[in-house]
């Protein structure tokens, strides 16, 4: 088994896929339906589940990226990374165990996710066999943002990216040569994975993410859709 540059196993299981290898549409998973005894998910549990769903999607996309290019082992990535302004957690954001601050952290998570949206849009035409996963990651991130915005008390502190700036960034990214586009794809996926993991660690520190109901296989099956909001 190969391991890519960031430690993912090639044979990593994608929990949100059903046995026929298709994405399970929201609310249509028989395993979810056949569990009437299950308590409804709290908003925090939904957020937790949603993030894990997205992380599984990223893992699928990273597999395709790493299989078709050598970007995952590239040593030139730091150079390319300087041209991307990808959101990253820092100590000052209040999301780490030391210096943890719930409100500051929640603002950082939402702001960061909003900033990632343009990069997720860029990813939409970058995959062949995983086109559906790329779309699912993008859409479920939008839903996650809405969930988190409902949780945040200080919405005024959240800065929304300028649409014009985003449009021009998207054009610039799409105009890169093939090698740089492959590198950009790899860096976006790696950074988004790290940001979501940091976010999940922080959200679990917020105290009310205690019990996450799962099916008997321990799989996170259902994508949370906008109708669930």
């Amino acid at each position: 088994d190969y391991k890519d540059h960031d430690g993912d196993y090639k044979d990593h299981d994608i929990d949100y896929k059903d046995d026929d290898d298709k994405l399970v549409p929201p609310g249509e998973d028989s395993k979810d339906v056949a569990a009437p005894h299950r308590q409804p998910l709290t908003s925090s549990e939904r957020i937790d589940k949603q993030i894990r769903y997205i992380l599984d999607g990223i893992s699928a996309l990273r597999k395709e990226t790493c299989n078709k290019s050598n970007m995952c082992e590239s040593s030139k990535e730091a150079l390319a990374e300087n041209n991307l302004n990808l959101p990253k957690m820092a100590e000052k954001d209040g999301c780490f165990q030391s210096g943890f601050n719930e409100e500051t952290c929640l603002v950082k998570i939402i702001t960061g996710l909003l900033e990632f949206e343009v990069y997720l849009e860029y990813l939409q035409n970058r995959f062949e066999s995983s086109e559906e996963q790329a779309r699912a990651v993008q859409m479920s991130t939008k839903v996650l943002i809405q969930f988190l915005q409902k949780k945040a008390k200080n919405l005024d502190a959240i800065t929304t990216p300028d649409p014009t700036t985003n449009a021009s960034l998207l054009t610039k990214l799409q105009a890169q040569n093939q090698w740089l586009q492959d590198m950009t794809t790899h860096l976006i996926l790696r950074s988004f994975k790290e940001f979501l993991q940091s976010s999940l660690r922080a959200l679990r520190q917020m105290g009310d993410l205690i019990s996450v109901p799962v099916d008997s296989r321990g799989s996170e099956q259902k994508l949370i859709s906008e109708e669930d909001l």
């Epitope: 430690g7 990593h12 100590e91 780490f96 993991q197 999940l200 679990r204 019990s211 296989r217 321990g218």
Partner: antibody, heavy 121, light 110 residues
């Protein structure tokens, strides 16, 4: 071949300090979550803490304030700074490479051989 | 504070036996559980992660199951090289935790 080699263990007096190193070869340290785990003689595994790729550190309750995990990516080396050592800190200390899917679920898929720390007067 | 409780603490078995080790979390940890094998004087070795996924190179006689709070490691037909101590590890939360590992189960020769 990927290797993790711990060093810096030895005999230290109660109240003293020690810094353990874990030199990593064959991989880029900055791309991995890393952990320290210890094992007292004849006892089970005891988690000390994690350092994640985002540079955040998480510690066991008993280790907070006394133990500090850091990394020097340019040297491909992980560190464990241990202060105010007690007799009960006597153990073999392992560094381990993590691979994380979600948040804290760091499966430790590669371990060093361990270094023995003895705290005694 | 999530606590991991393993049982039994030791088990005596013969080659060819089916051995089951359980691990219980004090609160739900979803499917975020790993199992390790450790032999005397050696570093632990990852066997299973995310409850049921076998790590690279691990024989198929090892399997894991469970979700939420109750987990099981099963060795379907014990081999001589399987006599060792086994540990579970929760990965759901590492904040406000004393130990992410269970206390261990020693599998001994009957």
């Amino acid at each position: 071949e990927v290797q993790l080699v711990e060093s810096g263990g030895g005999l230290v007096q109660p109240g003293g300090s020690l810094r353990l190193s874990c030199t990593v070869s064959g991989i880029d340290l900055s791309s991995y979550d890393m952990s320290w785990v210890r094992q007292a003689p004849g006892k089970g595994l005891e988690w000390v803490g994690y350092i994640y790729t985002d540079s955040s550190t998480y510690y066991a309750n008993w280790a907070k304030g006394r133990f500090t995990i850091s990394r020097d990516n340019s040297k491909n080396t992980l560190y464990l700074q241990m202060n105010s050592l007690r007799a009960e800190d006597t153990a073999v200390y392992y560094c381990a490479r993590g691979s994380t899917d979600y948040a804290f679920d760091t499966r430790l898929d590669l371990w060093g051989q361990g270094t023995l720390v003895t705290v005694s007067s | 504070d999530i606590q991991m409780t393993q049982s039994p603490s030791s088990v005596s078995a013969s080659v060819g036996d089916r051995v089951t080790i359980t691990c219980q979390a004090s609160q739900s940890i979803s499917n975020e559980l790993s199992w390790y094998q450790q032999k005397p004087g050696k570093a632990p070795k990852l066997l299973i992660y995310r409850t049921s996924t076998l790590a690279s190179g691990v024989p198929s006689r090892f399997s894991g199951s469970g979700s939420g709070t109750d987990f099981t490691l099963t060795i379907s037909s014990l081999q001589p090289e399987d006599f060792a101590t086994y540990y579970c590890q929760q990965g759901y939360n590492s904040n406000d935790v004393d130990n992410v590992f269970g206390g261990g189960t020693k599998v001994e020769i009957k």
